[in-house]
């Protein structure tokens, strides 16, 4: 684009250098060039010259008219056709920006991970504005009214250094550009309540050689959270189908989770936990193979018979995911044998 | 209360520097965001820079490059330090609590003048 140009007259935008795209812009050319009397003013759009819809409005002044203007960039200029002159003569230049004022922010969510020394948050920002546009994300202590902002694009970590004061804040995010500013619906957040734990982690997994063969899956996390809740799921490599098992955790000794499985078959395991009572999850932890060993004696497999947990609180539910193509989205078989729920919440989902 | 106090401006060449400062106290310093604004003769406020409660700054285009603002929260003082400055430049300069966008400029010092001129 242009940023410095010396102009010989002047460029001027209707109804400004930065308007919603889709409007009807008038883009005028006035000349103030010496020894000229122009025969023609002529407007070029990212170097190409224009040939439509251009008004003389008098002997220095021209103007080009852009039905529903939709480009999101263009570099304008004009020039004059000069009695004399064998190359036209710059007259002056400008940048021009269409795009849509910010939607408000949305599903603004805020966490500290264990031992990040952070408060991350993060929001929807909505459709594309194509044009400069800011996130301020306002941080105030419901205790000491002091607020504290944030420059960001899509997220913000916030030290938890500067959130000493108090435990206790409203968090908002003001969405700003040249056309418009929203604000997101306020967050009232206990810096208690967005602990998640430090990440949980399968370490590996082994199959005994008893008559009726069970896998041992261990897991661990550093976490310091006495109380935690967790659920692992899993499948075969070749299912769509996952089980989902629910337990309380004591993660001051690595954790020892018994399985019932296909002989001969190759699983994949992931966990994830949260404070017992509180809303945010982790992300699951990554997928963890293990090949169950070959059947030994004679025994009649029923898909699903059988997978659960020799403790009495765990349930198993089962999900399915929608299709190779959408991993990500899960939903509960239509029916299912066990009392179960959705996995909600997955980031690391796998087909 | 929120006070806020404006120093370093004066007469100065096109080409020429200065060092704005902005004593603070009433509140705490260290995590709020700040911002220099200005106003020209005869025109309305502008925003020229902000600095927001974690370091991050901001610059207005038509001084992007030519000033840099800074915070001493041991000293609980704003700076910009404004070079290569152009006739244009010339205003009453204001540090105000918060960022350039909202609920802007909601407290602001008295001011100090800056004249750009040869």
């Known amino acids: 684009g242009i940023t410095s140009i010396n102009c010989s007259g002047d460029m001027w935008v209707e109804p400004g250098e930065i308007f919603q795209m889709g409007m009807n812009v008038s883009i005028y050319c006035q000349e103030a060039l010496k020894h000229c009397r122009p025969r023609n003013l002529y407007f070029y759009k990212n170097g190409f010259k224009e040939e439509f819809d251009i008004t003389r409005i008098n002997r220095t002044t021209a103007r080009i008219w852009y039905k529903g203007f939709s480009e999101p960039h263009a570099y304008m200029h004009c020039t004059a056709e000069c009695p004399g002159h064998f190359q036209e003569t710059l007259i002056c230049g400008k940048d021009i920006s269409s795009g849509h004022p910010p939607d408000a922010p949305s599903n603004l969510t805020c966490v500290i991970y264990e031992y990040s020394g952070n408060m991350t948050c993060t929001w929807n920002t909505g459709k594309p504005t194509y044009i400069d546009t800011k996130y301020i994300v306002h941080v105030k202590s419901l205790e000491t009214e002091e607020e504290q902002q944030y420059l960001a694009s899509s997220y913000v970590k916030i030290s938890t250094d500067s959130l000493q004061g108090s435990r206790k804040y409203l968090v908002w995010v003001q969405a700003v550009n040249s056309l418009g500013m929203e604000n997101s619906q306020q967050l009232h957040v206990h810096l208690d309540d967005i602990v998640i734990p430090s990440a949980s982690i399968i370490s590996r997994a082994e199959t005994t050689n008893d008559t009726v063969p069970k896998t041992i899956v261990y897991w661990k996390s550093k976490t310091m959270i006495e109380k935690v809740f967790c659920e692992m799921r899993y499948k075969t490599t070749t299912n769509q189908t996952w089980s989902v098992k629910e337990f309380d955790a004591n993660f001051t000794y690595v954790q020892q989770s018994e399985f019932y499985l296909e002989p001969d078959s190759k699983y994949v395991f992931q966990v994830r936990c949260q404070e017992t009572g509180k809303r945010n999850w982790q992300p699951w932890s990554s997928p963890f193979v293990h090949q169950t060993s070959q059947e030994t004696g004679k025994r009649n497999w029923q898909p699903w018979s059988s997978p659960f947990v020799h403790q009495t609180s765990q349930t198993v539910s089962q999900v399915t995911a929608k299709s190779s193509h959408e991993p990500q989205k899960m939903e509960m078989l239509s029916a299912t044998i066990f009392r179960g729920h959705p996995a909600s919440g997955n980031h690391q989902d796998i087909g | 209360q929120v006070q806020l106090q404006e120093s370093g401006g004066g007469l100065v060449q096109p080409g020429g520097s200065l060092r704005l400062s902005c004593a603070a106290s009433g509140f705490t310093f260290s995590t709020s965001a700040m911002t220099w604004v200005r106003q020209a003769p005869g025109k309305g406020l502008d925003w020229v820079s902000g600095i927001d409660s974690g370091g991050t700054t901001v610059y207005a285009d038509s001084v992007k490059g030519r000033f840099t603002i800074s915070k001493d929260n041991a000293k609980n003082t704003l700076y910009l330090q404004m070079n290569s400055l152009k006739t244009e430049d010339t205003a009453v300069y204001y540090c105000?609590?918060?960022?350039?966008?909202?609920?802007?400029?909601?407290?602001r010092g008295q001011g100090t003048q800056v004249t750009v001129s040869s």
């Open positions: 105000a609590t918060g960022l350039p966008w909202g609920n802007i400029w909601r407290t």
